[in-house]
Interface confidence: low
């Protein structure tokens, strides 16, 4: 028994005065606790605890289950213990089969012995299988067998406690080790969408997915720069033993403009933390913004192609799109598509493909788009560049030569006189009158120019050339003159195209 200094309270004394006592099954256990301030006896084995307020603990017929630690406590809280083994050849182990181990920690296989004198107290795999090579253990007859540094790979390991009794191996009931994983990385978090655009009154719902090795991962939705607790709902799944998934769904049933902001899904475990954010923008009503991808004034050569392209932002989604020319709607020749396949996309592209444009097809081409909230439109002014065409070339009764040409841009008319039979008309003649006439065609059509010269100035046989030209090309008409006596005779005019 421990020695104490005089005057200090001393622990109780127990008879028999030894730390361990071995009795046979069926024998009597008689333990006496001597102390003037005796309070109680306590018996402990595995999860079981019994108390006795008598100072003498008597068990008339000992059973294996009476094996355990008997502790006598006095009123000073001081105690003394004796460990009793009740040897029962038919029950060598006391067993608590629940066996949980935290990864990288030690765990106790609770199979204390009822006979400390058996040998080779150890662990064995079930059905004769070997234990994992790296599994280390320390046996303790009073407590069980401590597995050192549990590995994740031991999960569901089936094992027995084992002893040798009279040269034979005796196994306990089987234990199944359940390993609780340690956190060795931060949680993996992801969000259903990185940004949300809503109208006032619409429901905002966003889901954060948290993945980790076990369900003890912590997660929450937070609003940046706010301490307000957000309402969230959870769903969770175990995809196998060390693969846990939680979905945390945040909902605002009727979003307001002032709900706009950044929301963070935060998760942490004992290793560290991770977060992901989503942005909410709430607008009071929908919108459409159109951005032309080319200049809205377009010049194109006759017979060439042009693509009228717009990008536009539309929220909510666009419902009607159309291209219009001269109050007519195009049914083909155009396509409309989202700028990206992203679920959050609000940007779209519309293209009108105009092919082999004629001079008569200039004008205003309008793109119209609408959604449930607003309409929007943009106009393109298309000018078709055409080489001049000489509409009329006549000798008027007043002796004037007149040439009328049409084209775009506005043609210039020059006059030349070729004396005799010369093919090249180089001497230029100044016109008497030049007028730009109003075209009867649609706006953006060809421009008509009329130019006149006085034929009385020509005194010799020859040819007069009316040449109309612009940036696209040129066209000429010719007047042939021959003098008979004093009379001037106009031979039929003709045109030649000079590229």
């Amino acid at each position: 028994q421990p020695s104490v200094s005089p005057g200090e309270p001393s622990p109780p004394s127990i008879h028999p005065g030894k730390s361990d006592l071995i009795v046979r099954v069926g024998d009597e256990i008689r333990l006496l606790c001597t102390d003037p301030g005796f309070v109680k006896w306590t018996f402990e084995i595995l999860d079981e605890t019994n108390e006795n307020k008598q100072n003498e603990w008597i068990t008339e017929k000992a059973e294996a289950t009476n094996t355990g630690k008997y502790t006598c406590t006095n009123k000073h809280g001081l105690s003394n213990s004796i460990y009793v083994f009740v040897r029962d050849p038919a029950k060598l182990f006391l067993v608590d089969r629940s066996l949980y181990g935290k990864e990288d920690n030690d765990t106790l296989v609770r199979c204390p012995l009822t006979d400390p004198e058996v040998t080779n107290y150890s662990l064995k795999g079930c059905q004769g299988k070997p234990l994992p090579k790296d599994l280390r253990f320390i046996p303790d007859p009073k407590a069980g067998i401590m597995i050192k540094s549990v590995k994740r790979a031991y999960h569901r390991l089936c094992l027995h406690c084992s002893v040798d009794q009279e040269g034979k191996s005796v196994l306990s009931e089987k234990f199944i080790l359940k390993v609780r994983p340690a956190f060795k990385a931060v949680p993996v978090v992801s969000v259903s969408k990185a940004s949300y655009l809503l109208r006032e009154g619409e429901e905002f719902t966003v889901t954060c997915t948290i993945k980790d090795v076990s369900s003890s991962v912590y997660s929450t939705w937070k609003r940046e720069n706010s301490q307000t607790k957000l309402q969230e709902k959870y769903n969770s799944w175990h995809h196998g033993d060390f693969n846990y998934e939680r979905q945390a769904t945040l909902t605002i049933s009727s979003a307001r403009v002032n709900d706009s902001g950044v929301f963070m899904c935060y998760a942490n475990n004992t290793f560290g933390s991770a977060n992901v954010t989503t942005t909410l923008e709430v607008v009071d009503k929908g919108f459409i913004n159109i951005f032309p991808m080319i200049n809205t004034t377009v010049f194109v050569n006759d017979g060439e192609n042009v693509d009228l392209i717009v990008e536009y932002e539309a929220f909510p989604k666009p419902e009607h799109q159309q291209w219009i020319y001269m109050n007519r709607t195009f049914t083909d020749k155009w396509e409309d598509y989202p700028k990206s396949e992203n679920e959050s996309n609000i940007r779209y592209v519309s293209e009108l493909h105009l092919t082999r444009l004629k001079g008569t097809e200039g004008g205003t081409y309008t793109f119209l788009v609408s959604n449930s909230d607003v309409n929007a439109a943009i106009a393109f002014n298309v000018y078709v560049n055409t080489k001049p065409e000489i509409l009329t070339y006549d000798r008027l009764v007043n002796g004037m030569l007149q040439c009328v040409a049409a084209g775009f841009p506005e043609p210039t008319i020059d006059w030349y006189f070729c004396p005799g039979t010369e093919q090249r008309c180089s001497a230029s003649v100044l016109p008497v009158d030049v007028q730009t006439l109003n075209s009867s065609g649609p706006p953006f059509g060809k421009l008509v120019v009329q130019s006149s010269i006085d034929s009385s100035a020509f005194k010799h046989n020859g040819t007069v050339e009316c040449k109309a030209y612009n940036d696209v090309g040129k066209t000429s008409a010719y007047f042939n003159f021959a003098f008979k006596g004093n009379n001037k005779e106009q031979i039929h005019p003709h045109t030649l195209f000079t590229p």
Partner: antibody, heavy 119, light 107 residues
Framework: EVQLLESGGGLVQPGGSLRLSCAAS????????MSWVRQAPGKGLEWVST????????YYADSVKGRFTISRDNSKNTLYLQMNSLRAEDTAVYYC????????????WGQGTLVTVSS | DIQMTQSPSSLSASVGDRVTITCRAS??????LNWYQQKPGKAPKLLIY???TLQSGVPSRFSGSGSGTDFTLTISSLQPEDFATYYC?????????FGGGTKVEIK
């Protein structure tokens, strides 16, 4: 989508052998313990065998121990049950099932394959 | 092996009734107790795991309780699609065992 599809059942004479297969899709077999459960005509469910996710640990009902062998081919994502020395009392629909983890029950089951042992 | 005993083995009930099925284990299985529903010609379906946790997608009229050796499955208001056989199963031991089943029939 998780799916389990058993095959290999049929009529066999007492003492004969059969190998049942369970093709898994929609998940990785190595992450889950897998079990075979059988149901004799008009009777209840009887557990037959379990194999751990790693394939390192196998467990059998006393009634089939020594005769049946559970295995898995992770490259084919397939579970097997080799049944030898078959008896009339082994006649049943055999289901393969996935353990949802940490013994939280068998969360996905195949449609079953019928094994009839009769002379 | 751990024996699982279900009672009653069959019962007749009407739509809207509250139905209770009990399952008793021959030794403590803590909360390692699962419930399944099986309809004729079909594979069993997991309803409840860990004695009281509803499997995803299972209606909330199903509930489970208990720990140790005594467990209960309750259907708060029986629906036409609930007529089936129900099994309990312990997964505490590596040797899984099922109860004998309870057949719920239309009265």
């Amino acid at each position: 989508e998780v799916q389990l599809l058993e095959s290999g059942g049929g009529l066999v004479q007492p003492g004969g052998s059969l190998r049942l297969s369970c093709a898994a899709s929609g998940f990785t077999l190595t992450s889950y313990a897998m079990s075979w459960v059988r149901q004799a005509p008009g009777k209840g469910l009887e557990w037959v065998s379990t194999i751990s996710g790693s394939g390192g640990y196998t467990y059998y009902a006393d009634s089939v121990k020594g005769r049946f062998t559970i295995s898995r081919d992770n490259s084919k994502n397939t579970l097997y049950l080799q049944m030898n020395s078959l008896r009339a009392e082994d006649t049943a629909v055999y289901y393969c099932a996935r353990d949802s983890g940490y013994d939280r029950g068998l969360d996905y089951w195949g449609q079953g394959t019928l094994v009839t042992v009769s002379s | 092996d751990i024996q699982m005993t279900q009672s009653p083995s069959s019962l007749s009930a009407s739509v809207g009734d509250r139905v209770t099925i009990t399952c008793r284990a021959s030794q403590s299985v803590r909360t390692y107790l699962n419930w399944y529903q099986q309809k004729p010609g079909k594979a069993p379906k997991l309803l409840i795991y860990d004695a009281s946790t509803l499997q995803s997608g299972v209606p909330s009229r199903f509930s489970g309780s208990g720990s140790g050796t005594d467990f209960t499955l309750t259907i708060s208001s029986l629906q036409p699609e609930d007529f089936a056989t129900y099994y309990c199963q312990q997964s505490y031991s590596s040797s899984i065992t099922f109860g004998g089943g309870t057949k719920v029939e239309i009265k």
